[in-house]
């Protein structure tokens, strides 16, 4: 059975600032045909037929659901892109994470401006404080890491707070073993 393709993002963040660039790539097994990819944005077929879809100078209208399809293979699972206009944006490597998988959080400043005195919060409680800006790395996510995250920091010597982001960590499916 042909595998469903998978949409990946580069950079890996699905929440980006207006004006930023992101490349969506349709990955799958044995897809050698360069121009045989269909891209769907909010259900509408895109003109792009390459395996990569480049979003340059992102606009609010670029927000929404993206899916790809190779040949007559099933459509990929959807990927959701959200375009923001703000000073600070909390970005996550994924918003739904399988238990045991890594999770990365980034407090990103608009236009890549220097951000400092960064505090990450989970469910209203401060998690980490850095004078210089750093990403948070959770190497093995657990269900307890689920929650509402946001960050605060200084940009241009002024204090800002990001919009909150819900992270859900789900239990990995148990392998079933049958007695022979």
């Amino acid at each position: 059975v042909p595998q469903k393709p998978k949409v990946s993002l580069n950079p890996p963040w699905n929440r980006i600032f207006k004006g930023e660039n992101v490349t969506l790539t349709c990955n799958g097994n044995n897809f050698f045909e360069v121009s045989s990819t269909k891209w769907f944005h909010n259900g509408s077929l895109s003109e792009e037929t390459n395996s990569s879809l480049n979003i340059v100078n992102a606009k609010f209208e670029d927000s929404g659901e993206y899916k790809c399809q190779h040949q007559q293979v099933n459509e990929s699972e959807p990927v959701y892109l959200e375009v923001f206009s703000d000073w600070l944006l909390l970005q996550a490597s994924a918003e739904v994470v399988m238990e045991g998988q890594p999770l990365f959080l980034r407090c990103h400043g608009w236009r890549n401006w220097d951000v400092y005195k960064v505090i990450y919060y989970k469910d209203g409680e401060a998690l980490k404080y850095w004078y210089e800006n750093h990403n948070i790395s959770i190497t093995n996510a657990t269900v307890e890491d689920s929650g509402t995250y946001y960050c605060t920091g200084k940009v241009w010597q002024l204090d800002y707070e990001s919009e909150p982001l819900n992270i859900t960590v789900i239990k990995a499916p148990r392998e079933k073993y049958w007695l022979q």
Partner: antibody, heavy 121, light 107 residues
Framework: EVQLVQSGAEVKKPGSSVKVSCKAS????????ISWVRQAPGQGLEWMGR????????NYAQKFQGRVTITADKSTSTAYMELSSLRSEDTAVYYC??????????????WGQGTTVTVSS | DIQMTQSPSSVSASVGDRVTIPCRAS??????LAWYQQKPGKAPKLLIY???NLQSGVPSRFSGSGSGTDFTLTISSLQPEDSATYYC?????????FGGGTKVEIK
């Protein structure tokens, strides 16, 4: 390479206003800010305020609040600093400087040549 | 306001000497500090940003160190053209403040 070119020397009467311009040549303001710094004769450097042209947001040192106005015209890549109610203590060289927010921790990496403002009756 | 203190206000040294110029912040500013050189009648020039990063085009004899409240600008081997006034500046919070300056003279 960006250069900041300031307007010429000014002689002003006490109580009047002065407006100094700062034009970016060889580049635009882009995502940078422009700070204004003054230096009285034989004295050190004093930060007055700054503007982020792309946003039109200006911030001022408390000392100058209400007396200084910093503006920018993105179309001509020019920043302006207007100081009102001039007094003799405002006699100084006024500098504009580009503030770099890209890994420079907001240091001022490009400076104008300075504009001498003399306040005298 | 964060006060920046530079002491001494002047230092005299010979060509080839190692010169250190201290700067102290009245509260912690991590690495949010810049150093500038100003020669008479000229605009200041950025030497060091983020406390220890050398600005492009600045000779490697200049270096910056420190974090928190205590910072140092070092000229490893003083040259005649280094005769100038050196200012530190904190970029952490409003109002942005400069030290009073340290004048370096050649003996």
């Amino acid at each position: 390479e960006v250069q900041l070119v300031q307007s010429g020397a000014e002689v002003k009467k006490p109580g009047s206003s002065v407006k100094v311009s700062c034009k970016a040549s060889g580049g635009t303001f882009s995502s940078y800010a422009i700070s204004w710094v003054r230096q009285a004769p034989g004295q050190g450097l004093e930060w007055m305020g700054r503007i982020i042209p792309i946003l039109g947001i200006a911030n001022y040192a408390q000392k100058f609040q209400g007396r200084v106005t910093i503006t920018a015209d993105k179309s001509t890549s020019t920043a302006y600093m207007e100081l009102s109610s001039l007094r003799s203590e405002d006699t100084a060289v006024y500098y504009c400087a580009r503030v770099n927010p890209f890994g420079y921790y907001y240091a001022m990496d490009v400076w104008g040549q300075g504009t001498t403002v003399t306040v005298s009756s | 306001d964060i006060q920046m203190t530079q002491s001494p206000s002047s230092v005299s040294a010979s060509v080839g000497d190692r010169v250190t110029i201290p700067c102290r912040a009245s509260q912690g500013i991590s690495s949010w500090l810049a150093w500038y050189q100003q020669k008479p009648g000229k605009a200041p020039k950025l030497l060091i940003y983020a406390a220890s990063n050398l600005q492009s085009g600045v000779p490697s004899r200049f270096s910056g160190s420190g974090s928190g409240t205590d910072f140092t600008l070092t000229i490893s081997s003083l040259q005649p053209e280094d005769s100038a006034t050196y200012y530190c500046q904190q970029t952490d919070s409003f109002p942005l403040t400069f030290g009073g300056g340290t004048k370096v003279e050649i003996k």
